[in-house]
Every structure is written in structure tokens, then in C-alpha cells.
Interface confidence: low
């Protein structure tokens, strides 16, 4: 669509007459019609298969026609099509003589024509004024012409039509060509899709309108490139969504069965060697002189009694000090410097002369032990403490310190290793001779029904449009992720682009 | 006030012969271009030939170049077409019209119409 423009500039009739040579009275009031067809090599009658138009008076004999409009005609005239301009045209020019103000052929006379002219040739589509001149005998006619394409047309041709916008349509302004050009922040053949926020990424994000970056279910971070793990996921991470892949020293479905007590709690003191010994449970292996499951107790080197014939005991920083009693030396007081007749044996022990007096011996009663019958039978030079406890003296009395899994006087009794409910997901626990058994529900297995097993929610490619299926471990289900263009918990729906568009 | 008024139209075997007459009358008869279109039902209205005022062109359409003639009359003001060879296809309402230009056919102006029928 277009428009032939025809700009009237100089109509020259200097003598005042008609193309029979008869003059006008008292002057040729002129005005013009015009007529545009398609090209013939010989203009001949025939349709104005392009259009025609025609002007009131502009003027009388010889006159200048002025840019603007002129007594309500329009210069210049306006000659509108709405076809492909084929670059070619045939035009005819009349000027015709109007005795008075009617200008209908009725009212004029039968000779009122003043002259004719006809032009074919070529022309393209442009701003540029074509500037041309006609004369006759008796007139001579300066005009100039040009087509242009009419509003939102474009082309060689004003054959490609091109209307701005910036709605859900599309977002774009037209080129000289007719070609669109996008907006900032738009994309596509129409414009219509958002380019998204630099560096958003191209699966797992999308975007509604330009410098956005939505995340897709499982994704979250500014770009969307970070999956988000299973939810519950304590010391765990994922590379794909609903993942908990557990970091070091962590077990479970969600991370968070500690398998390195002794890294993350340190609970062996005094420079005690943690050793791991299974889920939250460890053993300490003390330096000398501490004791305790967490080697938290100093022992004092004097609870083994290591001085003999009555001597005392000191506790030092490094060790021990035997104080001797009258008649012994040595670092336990176990050299002698008495004979039976300084009667040496105490609570009621016997006194046996030796080496010709020289030395002696005490025969003790029971509960009493030493070189003069002066200790007490230790209570656990018998290991009394079973399933490896540790006995302690204590005073008159003794007690066994038991090992994580037992209990009682003598640490007699095994703890039911099903006490703490070690079986996860309602598995049922069974005590063994050596340990325990989880007995898992349908769903679990593991050695404590720990790993999920149940029925893959994406086995039955719920997800359409090659969306990527998650397993939701937590609920059995799926999630879907969607390729761009498509919505819905399926990805089932199209974007909603209407079939056709407006232009 | 310009008046057209046809004449002539009626019903005519496949080969057959009609001549159709134009009255003008309210105008100056010579100085403009007068010509004959014709509109079949359902169909766009189809230009057939018209004649000039100056030097008497004659311009016909491809589809009836050959068997149709117009003239004119100046003297009576009347326009003819004289249709030969005529085929159903010719079957129309055939309108006379005025341009206001000299040279060129343009629908200006027209009458009521004649119904032309070529039937066996």
C-alpha cells in the first residue's frame, strides 16, 4: 500500500486558450484532472486502473500552483493505492477551462478542454521528487511526482507491512526495509521472547520479561544454576534436584547419621586416640595415667598400690613416691632390713625365718596380700569386670566401669542394642548374640532400613514435551522441569501464542 | 443532471447477435470518454470497452477483443456496442458510463443497466 503524489508546480498558458484555439472569456479559469494506470507503451484509453483525482480551479491563463492546500484542493494530490507498486505507471495530465464554479460535466462547455498530456516509465519507490516538464503548442505544465510507501509500509514494493509494538504481541520497531528490529531485552522472529538476565541459565531458568532469570522447580541461586537437594538434607549436597549426596564422614537419606564421631565432636581427652566405631558411636584408647570411656579421669598411680610392706603412697607429677616404713628400703620398699623377731608380719600373718635369719617370710591370712601381709587382696587382680569392662578400686569396695553395650555389677549384662532404635523408617529391630537385625518395611532396605528403595516416581515418563522427570524422594513423587515454551505440572501446555498474529 | 440510459439487452442463443444503445443527455457529450462494464451476479464488475472524446480510441477487454465494437455517435448522443459471437459467459447486466476525463475510462457516472442473457 502506497501513494502516488503528484505536486502541480507551473501551468503556463500565456495566450488564454482552449486546445481548439478558441479563446477563453474572459480568461482559462483551469483546474485538472488526473488519471494513473497501469504502464502501456502507448497510453490509451482505458481504466485508470491505479486511481484518479482532480482539482478545483487553481488558477487562471498562467499561474504558480503553491505547496499547501489551494482553494481546499490539495498540493500535492494524493493518488493512494493499495497493491504491490509494480515500479512502472502510465499517467495522463488534462487541464480543463471552467466557465464558473461548476465543475460538472453537465456545466462545462463542449470544448472546455485545454490541453493533455500522457507519460509512462519507471519509477521506484522513494522520497526524491521527480521533476519533469511538458509543453505543447499552446501550454507547457511543470510538475514533479513521486511514490511513497503509505504508514507501516515498507519495501521496495510497500509491499511488506510493519506496524510498531510493544505489547505480548511482539516488542520491536520497524526497519526502512520492513524488516523488524527488537527492542532492548527482546529476541525471536517477533520479539516476543525476553532475553533473559546475562548468564541465566539456558535450562533450569527462564524469564517473562527481559533481565529476569526465574528458576525452574529444583533450581535456585541469582542464575538458577544451583539445584536445591533433598529437602531435610543436612550435611549433603546434590548435582541434579532433590539429590543428598552426603559429604564426608555423613550417612543417611538426608545426611545426617554422623559415621565420623570423632572428627566432628573430638570427645577423647587428655590426648586420648579416637578410633570410629559405627553411627554416633566411637572408643577412646588412653594415654597412661587417664582412664574413662572419654579418658576424662586421671588416674593416680598410687590406686595400684605399688608400695610394698606397708608403705605410703604419694601421688607425684610424674609418677610416685613410696614412703617405707622402719626396716625397709628401695623404691617399693621391698627390701627388708628385719628379722622375725621384729615381728614384721602384720594382720596376723605368719613369720617364717630364712636364710638363716637372715631374711624372713609372711604367711598371710585370706583378704590379705604383700611381702608383711599389709594390702588388702585386690579386689581386681581377679578381672572380675566382664565383656572387657574396667575394675576400680575404691576403698574397701570395687566397681566395674563397663564398655558401651553392657551394664551391671560385673558389666554381666549386654544393653539391647535395640534400646536406641537404631532401625530407620519403622524398621523392626531383633537383638543377635553379636549385634542387632533390622527387619525393613516394604520400600527400605539397609542395614538399618536407611536406603530408599521404593518405586521410581519417573518410571512412567509422566513428564511431556521432553521435560527432565525428578524422583521427590521425600513423597513418592515427581517433579517435572520444563523446556522453555511449555508449562503446567506436565509440562503439557504450550505458552499461549494465539494461532495467527494481528498484522 | 447527467442521464445514461441503456437499451437493447435481452435473451440470445449461443453465436448470436445484440446491439446495445446508450442516451446521454445533461452533459456536453463530446468532450469526455464514455464506455460500457458489465457485472455478472456474484461476480466483480468487469470493464469492456470504452471510446474516447477527442480522436475516438477504442479500448476493449481481452475477454470480448474481437467480437465486440463501440462507437459513437456525437450528433445523437449515443454510445453502441455491438456484441458478436456472443457466449454464455457474456451473460451480465451491461451498464453504459461516463468518465470525466477525455482520455480515459473511469466510473464517474452510470446508468441502470440491461440484462443481456445468452442461453440455448
Known amino acids: 500500500s502506497g501513494v502516488f503524489q503528484l505536486q502541480l508546480q507551473e501551468f503556463i498558458n500565456e495566450r488564454g486558450v482552449l486546445a481548439s484555439g478558441r479563446p477563453c472569456e474572459p480568461g482559462c479559469r483551469t483546474f485538472f484532472r488526473v488519471c494513473l494506470k497501469h504502464f502501456q507503451a502507448v497510453v490509451s484509453p482505458g481504466p485508470c486502473t491505479f486511481g484518479t483525482v482532480s482539482t478545483p480551479v487553481l488558477g487562471t491563463n498562467s499561474f504558480a500552483v503553491r505547496d499547501d492546500s489551494s482553494g481546499g484542493g490539495r498540493n500535492p494530490l494524493q493518488l493512494p493505492f493499495n497493491f504491490t507498486w509494480p515500479g512502472t505507471f502510465s499517467l495522463i495530465i488534462e487541464a480543463w477551462h471552467a466557465p464558473g464554479d461548476d465543475l460538472r460535466p453537465e456545466a462545462l462547455p463542449p470544448d472546455a478542454l485545454i490541453s493533455k498530456i500522457a507519460i509512462q516509465g519507471s519509477l521506484a519507490v522513494g522520497q526524491n521528487w521527480l521533476l519533469d516538464e511538458q509543453t505543447s503548442t499552446l501550454t507547457r505544465l511543470r510538475y514533479s511526482y513521486r511514490v511513497i510507501c503509505s504508514d507501516n509500509y515498507y519495501g521496495d514494493n510497500c509491499s511488506r507491512l510493519c506496524k510498531k509494538r510493544n505489547d505480548h504481541f511482539g516488542h520491536y520497531v520497524c526497519q526502512p526495509d520492513g524488516n523488524l528490529s527488537c527492542l532492548p531485552g527482546w529476541t525471536g522472529e517477533y520479539c516476543q521472547q525476553p532475553i533473559c538476565l546475562s548468564g541465566c541459565h539456558e535450562q533450569n531458568g527462564y524469564c517473562s520479561k527481559p533481565a529476569e532469570c526465574l528458576c525452574r522447580p529444583g533450581w535456585q541461586g541469582r542464575l538458577c544454576n544451583e539445584c536445591i537437594p533433598h529437602n531435610g538434607c543436612r550435611h549433603g549436597t546434590c548435582s541434579t534436584p532433590w539429590q543428598c549426596t552426603c559429604d564426608e564422614g555423613w550417612g543417611g537419606l538426608f545426611c545426617d547419621q554422623d559415621l565420623n564421631y570423632c572428627t566432628h565432636h573430638s570427645p577423647c581427652k587428655n590426648g586420648a586416640t579416637c578410633s570410629n566405631s559405627g553411627q554416633r558411636s566411637y572408643t577412646c584408647t588412653c594415654r597412661p595415667g587417664y582412664t574413662g570411656v572419654d579418658c576424662e579421669l586421671e588416674l593416680s598411680e598410687c590406686d595400684s598400690n605399688p608400695c610394698r610392706n606397708g608403705g605410703s603412697c604419694k601421688d607425684q607429677e610424674d609418677g610416685y613416691h613410696c614412703l617405707c616404713p622402719p626396716g625397709y628400703y628401695g623404691l617399693h620398699c621391698e627390701h627388708s632390713t628385719l628379722s622375725c623377731a621384729d615381728s614384721p608380719c602384720f594382720n596376723g600373718g605368719s613369720c617364717r625365718e630364712r636364710n638363716q635369719g637372715a631374711n624372713y617370710a609372711c604367711e598371710c591370712p585370706p583378704n590379705f596380700t604383700g611381702s608383711n601381709c599389709e594390702k588388702k587382696v585386690d579386689r581386681c587382680t581377679s578381672n572380675p569386670c566382664a565383656n572387657g569392662g574396667q575394675c576400680l578400686n575404691r576403698g574397701p569396695s570395687r566397681m566395674c566401669r563397663c564398655r558401651p553395650g553392657f551394664t551391671g555389677t560385673y558389666c554381666e549384662l549386654h544393653v539391647s542394642d535395640c534400646a536406641r532404635n537404631p532401625c530407620a523408617h519403622g524398621g523392626t529391630c531383633h537383638d543377635l548374640e553379636n549385634g542387632l537385625m533390622c527387619t525393613c518395611p516394604a520400600g527400605f532396605s539397609g542395614r538399618r532400613c536407611e536406603v530408599r528403595t521404593s518405586i521410581d516416581a519417573c518410571a512412567s515418563s509422566p513428564c511431556f514435551n521432553r521435560a527432565t522427570c525428578y524422583t521427590d524422594l521425600s513423597t513418592d513423587t515427581f517433579v517435572c522441569n520444563c523446556p522453555y515454551g511449555f508449562v503446567g505440572s506436565r509440562c503439557e501446555f504450550p505458552v499461549g501464542l494465539p494461532p495467527s498474529f494481528p498484522w | 443532471e447527467v442521464q445514461l440510459v441503456e437499451s437493447g439487452g435481452g435473451l440470445v442463443q449461443p453465436g448470436g447477435s445484440l446491439r446495445l444503445s446508450c442516451a446521454a443527455s445533461g452533459f456536453t457529450f463530446e468532450n469526455y470518454a464514455l464506455g460500457w462494464f458489465r457485472q455478472a451476479p456474484g461476480k466483480e464488475r468487469e470493464w469492456v470497452s470504452c471510446?474516447?472524446?477527442?480522436?475516438?480510441?477504442?479500448y476493449y477487454a481481452d475477454s470480448v477483443r474481437g467480437r465486440f465494437t463501440i462507437s459513437r455517435d456525437n450528433a445523437k448522443n449515443t454510445v453502441y456496442l455491438q456484441m458478436n459471437r456472443l457466449k454464455p459467459e457474456d451473460t451480465a447486466i451491461y451498464y453504459c458510463?461516463?468518465?470525466?476525463?477525455?482520455?480515459?475510462?473511469?466510473?464517474?457516472?452510470w446508468g441502470q443497466g440491461t440484462q443481456v442473457t445468452v442461453s440455448s
Open positions: 458510463a461516463l468518465s470525466l476525463g477525455s482520455s480515459w475510462c473511469a466510473y464517474d457516472y
Open positions: 471510446i474516447s472524446s477527442s480522436d475516438g480510441t477504442t
